[in-house]
Each structure stands twice: as C-alpha cells, then as structure tokens.
C-alpha cells in the first residue's frame, strides 16, 4: 500500500498532500514543497522533508568520543535541492549563488564557495552518533532495558533493520545511539540511517513527522524518557574538506 486508503493520508509523513488520483483511484501522496510522490509505507527522505519544512509556514567509560572528522549540523535549516530519488544533490546553493558540498544527510562538508564549486559525488554518511542527555530520574535506567527499548523503537517505529543499530551506550544521564550503514550494506528497500536519525530527532523535539501522532512517548519499564538535549554527529565515508581557517 502507498497510503491509508480509508481516509487517504500518509501515515509516515504528515507533510504531504494526498488525493485518490493514483492508478485505479488509489490514494497517492505528494511531498509539500517538491510535489514528489512518496512511498507512505516507509520513511520519506530527509531531503524531501527539509524541502517540505521550508515550504511550510515557519563506570568504565563507555561513551564514544566523536572522531575529529565528525560533522555537526551547525548550519541548520535550508531549502535543499533533491535528486529524482529524493536524495540530497551533492552541491547545494542558496539564492545568492553561495554553494557548498553536502553529505548524504544534507550536512555541509566543505567551505562555502561560489557557482564554480565542484562536488564530484554525494559522499555517504556511514556512521551517525546520536548523543542524548535525559532528565534526572529517581535512579539510572537499566542499561539492558534501555538498549532493548531503543532498538525496538528504531526497528518498529522507524523501520530500520536491527543490524544498523550498532550500539547503545549509557552513562547516566548520557545516552548514545550508534547507527552504522555502509554503502555496501544498504540493500534496496532498507531505510537509510540518516532518515531514521532525522525522524528520531524530530520525535524527540516533539515535532513528530508521523500522521496524526501527537509526539513520541518513550518509556523504559514504564518510566518516560525525557530528553533535555540532543546532539547528532555525522561521520562520512570520506573525511570532510574544510580549510584550516575554519578549524582555528
């Protein structure tokens, strides 16, 4: 199925316009902003979601140290160019002809340049580290319960294959979720870790992208997990290219 037939809505993407104009009168949904048809049985790509968002009215130390090459999305929102499959185009430019190269999750990985800037390929983000700080609770969460519930969340809510959730680390109050997915590992039909991470990020912020859902209620043995801060680090298959000027 592509969308909920009874009332013609897209369960996995509320930022769509749906109508029964598909083959045989079937419900078909198109993303706001781009007008591209989306598959409502899976997650919509982050590129199309960002475009739609821009078109809408406005103990032993187990924690991971992000690599020196890890990227954080400091640039925030922009209106991206998406390819016909809904992926980010390697080169993004704004209305003032300032251009930059992005990775597969749409995060800038080079200095900004002009229209002469070349981005030869879309570099894949193969490792995502989601760093959360939860609100203080009566006691620490049980690590294995937390691990199981987060894996269940990514498997069932975001439809991400369990093999792509590499690890869940916990050192109260910090939780880290590691997602890993190489180009060679990602089969046709697999949810992209970048898309799963984006849906999770929006859920955690109380901005669920799912149709008709008020927000994420994540519980560990009945206790709500309340996230106070979220940081997401992106690691690309090829390290980013920034000038020394930016690093100092």
């Amino acid at each position: 199925h592509t969308a909920a037939q009874d009332n013609c809505t897209c369960p996995t993407n509320k930022m769509t316009v749906c109508s029964p104009d598909g083959p045989g009168g079937r419900c078909q949904c198109r993303a706001l902003g781009s007008g591209m048809a989306v598959d409502c049985s899976t997650l919509t790509s982050k590129c199309l979601l960002l475009k739609a968002r821009m078109s809408a009215p406005k103990n032993a130390r187990t924690l991971v140290r992000p690599s020196e090459h890890a990227l954080v999305d400091n640039d925030g929102l922009y209106d991206p160019d998406c390819d016909p499959e809904g992926r980010f185009k390697a080169r993004q430019c704004n209305q003032t002809s300032v251009c930059w190269c992005v990775n597969s999750v749409g995060v800038r990985r080079t200095d900004k340049g002009d229209l002469s800037l070349r981005c030869d390929e879309l570099v894949r983000t193969h490792h995502i580290l989601i760093d959360l700080r939860h609100r203080p609770t009566a006691g620490a969460f049980n690590h294995s319960d937390l691990d199981a519930e987060l894996r269940r969340l990514f498997r069932e809510r975001y439809r991400l294959h369990p093999k792509f959730v590499a690890a869940v680390h916990y050192e109260q109050p910090t939780i880290q979720i590691e997602l890993r997915q190489n180009t060679s590992q990602k089969a046709a039909g697999d949810v992209d870790i970048g898309d799963a991470a984006y849906y999770f990020e929006r859920d955690i912020k109380g901005e669920s992208l799912f149709q008709g859902r008020g927000g994420l209620d994540l519980r560990v043995r009945g206790e709500p997990l309340q996230v106070e801060r979220t940081l997401i680090y992106y690691l690309d298959e090829i390290p980013p290219k920034f000038s020394m000027k930016r690093l100092t």
Epitope: E149, R157, G206, G214, L216, R221, E223, P224, E228
Partner: antibody, heavy 119, light 112 residues
C-alpha cells in the same frame, strides 16, 4: 481491526483469587502494552497494572502485593491474577491497550468483566 | 504517587450550554523536552467502556467532535464542551501518564 476480549469468572468467594484473560486481535503483544483497570459499582476508574510490549510489568503500588500480570505472546493473551479478594474488590475489570510510542493512552478497551466477590 | 483531582464531581447542564471541568495534578505533567503534557481525557457513558477523547492534554482523537477542547499545562487542565448535546451526558475522567497512571475521580455531566 483491534479488539480485546475478556473472559473470567463472574463470582469469586472472599479470600479466593481472581483470574481474568484478555485475548487480543488486530495487533501484536510484542508491539503494544496492555493495562488492567477496574471500576467498583458507581465509582471511578482505578489503574491496576500494565504488561509492557517488552515483557516488563508495573503495578499500582497499593495493590502490588496481590497482583500478578503475565502474557503469552503466541496466543495473544494477557492474564490478570489477583489474590485474597474481599467484597470491596467487586466491580468491572477492564483490559485496555496503550498506544506504544504515541503515548500511554488507552484507545482500545475490552468489554469488561463484572466480578462479584460474595460468599 | 501523583494524585489527580477533578472538579466539580457533578454538573447539571442544559443542552446548548458551554461546560468546563477541571483536573489538577499533584505535580507537573509537562515533558520539558517535547513541551507536551502527559494528560488524557476519557468519556464513559452508562454501561459502556471508557472512550479516549483527548491525548497530550489538547490533541483531539480522531472522530471526536470539535466541541470538545482540552487545554492547560503543568498541573492545571480543563476540558471544555462548547455546546453540550444530549449524547455528551456521561462521566469524564482525566488520567496522568507522567509516572505510571492515575485517574481523577471523574466529573458526572447530567441534564438539568
């Protein structure tokens, strides 16, 4: 479609135990939690306990010593057992599904089992 | 344990009237991260199982008439029925899910 059907004895003798089964259809017990709620005649709703999708349980602290909730995922059944019943345990007993990560709201309820504690 | 207090316990109204009922919790039900409140409203008609009306304090469930509105945040919540219909006569319960679950004592809506 989502359904919860309850079965269990209507009459229980004082000091005996109560067992009610909630058989679900239209969803999996590995994806959704099931709660138990009761309502004495003419009174309000009281939450008893929950069996979470992952298999863990929580109970109303005032009744914890007398309650036990279990499940059989393969048979799509959740079981409530309550010991040492007294006359003030008389009432309607409901099972209800929570909405998983969309909130611990009880959007689907069983039809209720009327339990009378009497000699 | 979180206590939930509803008032009034009963309310006699005429059809077409606007009605408000209150629910107060003994501690805040607000998730500061998502800015959402762990509060629901249920309607129970005589001889029936309860029905979920409002989740997250203000999100109306599918199929619930828009005359029902939930509002409030933190510890103080309100259910408003803008123009009461005969079929709205029931008992209304609030429920917190911030720390497991607790129902309020209920507000009974009766015809004058």
């Amino acid at each position: 479609q989502v359904q919860l059907k309850q079965s269990g004895p209507g009459l229980v003798a004082p000091s005996q135990s109560l067992s009610i089964t909630c058989t679900v259809s239209g969803f999996s017990l590995t994806s959704y939690g099931v709660n138990w709620i009761r309502q004495p005649p003419g009174k309000g709703l009281e939450w008893l306990g929950v069996m979470w999708a992952g298999g863990s349980t929580n109970y109303n602290s005032a009744l914890m010593s007398r309650l036990s909730i279990s499940k059989d995922n393969s048979k799509s059944q959740v079981f409530l057992k309550m010991n040492s019943l007294q006359t003030d345990d008389t009432g309607m007993y409901y099972c209800a599904r929570d909405e998983n990560w969309d909130g611990a709201w009880f959007a689907y309820w069983g039809q209720g089992t009327l339990v009378t504690v009497s000699a | 344990d979180i206590q939930m207090t509803q008032s009034p316990s009963s309310l006699a109204v005429s059809a077409g009237e606007k009605v408000t009922m209150s629910c107060k919790s003994s501690q805040s039900l607000l998730n500061s991260g998502t800015r959402k409140n762990y509060l629901a409203w249920y309607q129970q008609k005589p001889g029936q199982s309860p029905k979920l009306l409002i989740s997250w304090a203000s999100s109306r469930e599918s199929g619930v008439p828009d005359r029902f509105t939930g509002s409030g945040s933190g510890t103080d919540f309100t259910l408003t029925i803008s123009s009461v219909q005969a079929e709205d006569l029931a008992v209304y319960y609030c429920k917190q899910s911030y720390n497991l679950f607790t129902f309020g004592g209920g507000t009974k809506l009766e015809l004058k």
